[in-house]
Interface confidence: low
């Protein structure tokens, strides 16, 4: 069977696969998925191995009409380097020469010039080219070469191994060599796979079962960190609790070097952030951290000083922490939008069973502040979603010079956010450097500001406006109409319509279907409409819906189904990658994220067209 | 950081034409939609037209005689009014992506 890194390498004019038949002789046969002289995978971002012979593809010289055959994978040689061109040739690095299919004569693949029919590969039973099932780096844990990659293959004790193996051991732990000749430089590592024995790389909190991996004798930048604990189905460390971080505080006071955590302000726009997405709401940083030189934008926890937060450029090479398990956080169900009829009294503004209201003239301290809303039957806004601090933004008319007070203190516990009203912090959206939390001046309250409404920790003695939220009532005053301008069954955000096709359908029936109604398949402009899509069926059972996106037109181009351009995109994680298809929006807790899937795959999808007659919640004017 | 700046604003009679701009600064990049929005006193603010990627729209009351239309290059927007009837007078808002932006507003006034 074939795992998922190998594949058949298939000529579509001939209809056959390639066939490494010797180490000197590479040709083509019918193809067939069981034989082993036919499968071949990347071994590294630019070397092709022979399954069967732990060979590389490779040529004598970089010139025209030459035979490809085996060779010793050799990471550094010029004449195993292979790159994808334009659509499905392959071809040597740097080079306008190409995989070719050989003729008449010569039965053996060949390295040509031409870039015809015959110097054109897919991977068998795909439309893919060959890179659609590229290398990706497999970094070591443990053993001794501070967590460098598998080289694959690696011989050990002469023989090749392309896999991780238990050779040479008795407990069953996979291992790799991190060179190729493991016989002669004993470099080597634990691979970051389920093993017998593998859950003892990992130290569970009793009190939370939260998992930790500490990997202190590895030096990995923090993007290849990252990636090590994301292999494991982990992430980097985030730290939302007092109790986790005095946890961990023990787990690492016999070491002295930096480990890099998830924490993070790599996002251009945004202040300090968790990379599996956790509220930033505990603050432990080393005294004069974070540091606002350009750059340093990684955490490291610093064992040696109490284990207390360090930023430092992200290319540094350190050890890290990994985090796996029930997250730390109180669970806590925040209903959707439509799952709640909102009536609210005068003045206020409904959204998903609550209300709001933004005090902008009568300027507050924040005490004050929250003492006016609780009056009001309310507290100061809390904000558990993007669609939540969307919906303020877009709906309540939100202007991007507002610096207004929100529920956000750490009044109670220095160092540690809670909102007012009680509810767990489960989201937060910090300004580019924020929290700053200086020193010099207490800044234990937060104000919403900017034109994205992202929040800074302040003084809570300044007077500014506010924003305050109560529970809506079941029966009120006045029930706002908000879906005028669409018909029955669609639901209204700004200038559009929406509506849920129920039916699963392949992209193509989803498109007709939309077509059907006057409409299309959605197109996603910018953030605020994906946070209102994310909210509409984000919370859904199904696992995906359909947008208009795809590449279906011009492989490797993805251009939405009606003439508008793609000025934004929102790709899950290894999204889009080089896989051709059709473009479905996440739910669950991906919610909203973009994947490529198979345009014949059946999803629900989200048709849209423009309201008629659109209006716009009234926006208090300053 | 976006700024819009509305300009064109001003008295005439019904029946008359105005143009108005709306001159966008800043990271102008960033924007995919516009729209022009009016209040009139004591009113809802409502949308009089929007326009995003090549598509315009119009709300029924304005319809056949006003016409929105951007100018990429001067990064401009404009709303070409004919007809003009006093139920049009109102301040007159630019916007840009769904509301995170706002102009000051400009004000016209359609009275004999």
């Known amino acids: 069977l074939l795992d998922t890194r190998q594949f058949l390498i298939y000529n579509e004019d001939h209809k056959r696969c390639v066939d490494a038949v010797s180490p000197s002789a590479v040709q083509t046969a019918a193809c067939n998925q069981d034989a082993e002289s036919q499968k071949f995978r990347w071994v590294s971002e630019s070397q092709i191995m022979s399954v069967a012979f732990k060979l590389c593809l490779g040529v004598p010289s970089k010139t025209d009409w030459v035979a490809i055959t085996l060779y010793a994978c050799d990471s550094k040689s010029e004449f195993q380097k292979w790159e994808c061109k334009n659509d499905t040739l392959l071809g040597i690095k740097g080079e306008d020469l190409f995989f070719n299919y050989g003729n008449r004569q010569e039965k053996n693949i060949m390295l040509y010039k031409g870039s015809g029919l015959w110097s054109r590969w897919k991977i068998y039973g795909t439309t893919d080219n060959l890179c659609s099932r590229g290398y990706e780096a497999m970094y070591t844990l443990l053993g001794n070469a501070n967590g460098a990659t598998c080289a694959f293959p690696f011989k050990f004790e002469n023989k090749w191994y392309a896999d991780c193996t238990s050779a040479g051991r008795s407990d069953g732990w996979l291992w790799c060599g991190t060179t190729t000749d493991y016989d002669t430089d004993k470099l080597f590592g634990y691979c970051p796979l389920k093993f017998e024995g593998s859950e003892s790389l990992w130290n569970k909190d009793p009190l939370t079962s939260v998992s930790y991996q500490i990997n202190s004798k590895s030096a990995l930048t923090w993007h290849q960190a990252r990636k090590s604990c994301q292999q494991q189905n982990a992430e980097l460390l985030s730290i939302t609790e007092i109790h986790e971080q005095t946890y961990l505080t023990g787990l690492t006071s016999s070491l002295t070097s930096g480990l890099w955590i998830g924490l993070n302000s790599l996002s251009f726009n945004s202040g300090w952030q968790w990379s599996d997405r956790s509220p930033f709401r505990y603050l432990n940083w080393l005294p004069g951290s974070p540091s606002a030189e350009p750059g340093k934008s990684c955490v490291s926890l610093n064992p040696g000083k109490n284990a207390k937060w360090e930023n430092l450029e992200c290319v540094q090479k350190l050890g890290y922490i990994c985090k796996k398990g029930n997250t730390t956080l109180n669970s806590f169900v925040i209903p959707s939008e439509s799952d709640v009829p909102t009536h609210c009294p005068s003045q206020w503004w409904p959204y998903a069973g609550h209300c709001y209201k933004i005090h902008r003239d009568e300027k507050k301290i924040q005490r004050d502040a929250l003492t006016t809303c609780r009056k009001e039957g309310g507290d100061l806004t809390s904000i558990h979603t993007i669609e939540e601090l969307d919906f303020i933004i877009s709906q309540l008319g939100y202007e991007p010079n507002d610096e207004l007070w929100i529920g956000l203190n750490d009044i109670k516990i220095q160092m540690y956010f809670e909102w007012s009203d009680g509810t767990p912090v489960t989201f937060t959206k910090w300004l580019r450097g924020e929290p700053s939390h200086e020193n010099n001046r207490q800044e234990d309250c937060v104000v919403m500001k900017g034109k994205d409404g992202y929040w800074a920790d302040r003084g809570c003695e300044w007077p500014l406006g506010y924003i305050c939220k109560m529970k809506s009532r079941s029966q009120g005053p006045e029930i706002v109409e908000v879906e005028k301008g669409c018909r029955k069954g669609w639901k209204k955000h700004h200038f559009y319509c929406y509506m849920i096709g129920h039916t699963l359908s392949t992209f193509a029936e989803a498109n007709q279907t939309c077509n059907n109604e006057n409409a299309y398949l959605t197109t996603i402009e910018d953030r605020y409409e994906q946070a209102f899509l994310t909210s509409f069926v984000g919370l859904r059972p199904e696992k995906y819906f359909w947008t208009g996106l795809s590449d279906i037109q011009t492989k490797g181009t993805f251009q939405w189904t009606i003439e508008e351009e793609v000025r934004f995109t929102h790709w899950n994680s290894d999204m889009p990658g080089r896989k051709p298809g059709c473009v479905a929006m996440r739910t669950g807790i991906a919610g909203g994220l973009w994947d490529v899937l198979k345009c014949d795959e059946k999803a629900k999808f989200v048709c849209k067209h423009w309201a008629e007659g659109v209006t716009h919640p009234p926006k208090p004017t300053t | 950081q976006v700024q819009l700046q509305e300009s064109g604003g001003t008295l005439v009679q019904p029946g008359g034409s105005l143009r108005l701009s709306c001159a966008a600064s800043?990271?102008?990049?960033?924007?995919?939609?516009m729209g022009w929005y009016r209040q009139a006193p004591g009113k809802q603010r409502e949308l009089v037209a929007g326009i995003t990627g090549g598509n315009t729209h119009y709300a029924d009351s304005v319809k056949g005689r006003f016409t929105i239309s951007r100018d990429n290059a001067k990064n401009t927007m404009y709303l070409q009014m004919n007809g003009l009837k006093p139920e049009d007078t109102a301040v007159y808002y630019c916007?840009?992506?769904?509301?995170?932006?706002w102009g000051q507003g400009t004000q016209v006034t359609v009275s004999s």
């Open positions: 800043g990271s102008t990049f960033s924007i995919n939609n």
């Open positions: 916007n840009a992506n769904w509301g995170a932006y």
